[in-house]
């Protein structure tokens, strides 16, 4: 899976969309999880309604919401009041049994609010690396990760 970058402004809402084959994933609940480290587990943040037929109902966990258009095949995650600590690598997942298939890998970047003149030093952006393959740039707030970018800040 290539990684798609979604950029949002601190303090505002960010919508992440994850398209999928609606027939292939028919009947399956979805989830949004945060990757803990480059090879670590993906920690569940929020999942769609327990009854798949009600997946269109928005479910919240804190400031994160999820809703699923099961006919159109689009999972939408909303991160409300985006904060610097929300930056990082996430996954949209399709659940079956206790397993989860990755629908999309997402890198969330948090940009400084241009109207906020406070120190933006704690805002995080990806560093340099050569661990990711070529990927095309997508529209507006989202793009695929460029070659040479890494989704985790240096640990040293």
């Amino acid at each position: 899976h290539n990684t798609t970058v979604f950029q949002g402004v601190a303090g505002q809402s960010l919508q992440v969309s994850c398209p999928y084959d609606s027939m292939k994933h028919w009947g399956r609940r979805k989830a949004w999880c945060r990757q803990l480290g480059e090879k670590g587990p993906c920690q569940r943040v929020v999942s769609t309604h327990n009854l798949w037929l009600l997946s269109f109902l928005r479910r919240w966990n804190g400031s994160t919401a999820i809703t699923d258009d099961t006919l159109g095949g689009t999972l939408t995650i909303t991160l409300r009041n985006l904060q610097p600590h929300d930056a990082g690598l996430y996954q949209c997942q399709s659940l079956h049994g206790s397993e989860a298939d990755t629908l999309r890998k997402v890198l969330v970047e948090v940009l400084a609010d241009p109207l906020d003149h406070r120190d933006a030093g704690d805002l995080w952006f990806p560093g340099e690396s050569e661990s990711f393959e070529d990927a095309h740039v997508e529209h507006s707030i989202s793009r695929s990760l460029l070659e040479g970018e890494i989704p985790f800040p240096p640990t040293s």
Epitope: D21, M23, K24, W26, G27, R28, R29, L51, W52, L53, L95, H96, G97, S98, E99
Partner: antibody, heavy 123, light 107 residues
Framework: EVQLVQSGAEVKKPGESLKISCKGS????????IAWVRQMPGKGLEWMGI????????RYSPSFAGQVTISADKSISTAYLQWSSLKASDTAMYFC????????????????WGQGTLVTVSS | DIQMTQSPSSVSASVGDRVTITCRAS??????LAWYQQKPGKAPKLLIY???SLQWGVPSRFSGSGSGTDFTLTISSLQPEDFATYFC?????????FGQGTKLEIK
Amino acid sequence: EVQLVQSGAEVKKPGESLKISCKGSGYSHTSYWIAWVRQMPGKGLEWMGIIYPGDSDTRYSPSFAGQVTISADKSISTAYLQWSSLKASDTAMYFCARSRTFYYDSSDYFDYWGQGTLVTVSS
Amino acid sequence: DIQMTQSPSSVSASVGDRVTITCRASQGISSWLAWYQQKPGKAPKLLIYAASSLQWGVPSRFSGSGSGTDFTLTISSLQPEDFATYFCQQADSYPRTFGQGTKLEIK
């Protein structure tokens, strides 16, 4: 009426190749996953792997990975199971089965099965 | 892999009897379990899915229960056509695995 029709019985020699088929009808072939299950003579059922014909996404049991190849041709609603070099131990009945996800619990179960293809490998 | 263990491996019973077959998973599988019936020379047939949901067209004398690691299939009043082999199967994770089977024979 939903049907999975498998190809006929095969008698082969060790080292030969083989490809058996499973043709689905009465439903949209790109809406369901298709699994292959082995049953050796007088034994139980063994899940070999599964394929989604829409994009050929395939999962194998570790026990069968590298031993067989599962493929599909969505244009003719057919899934395949093939061997490049058969062994006597491959002698078994092979079933294909449609995997249906039940939205009650978001997991999948085998609701329709083919009649089975008996493969005999003997020198 | 998750191991599925059925007991007994065979059982003799008479028409009208109540029969219970058990299936134990080597780890918790929530309610992701199915039961199949297989007759000699035939393909398996789905009876129960999600541990307790009756597949369409299956007689109501068949019922399933359990969650986690322990599951049961019950036939409330055996009919002549019920003499067959029964398999449980976990739908929790790949690879899907089946129990070794329970052969139900006429006493």
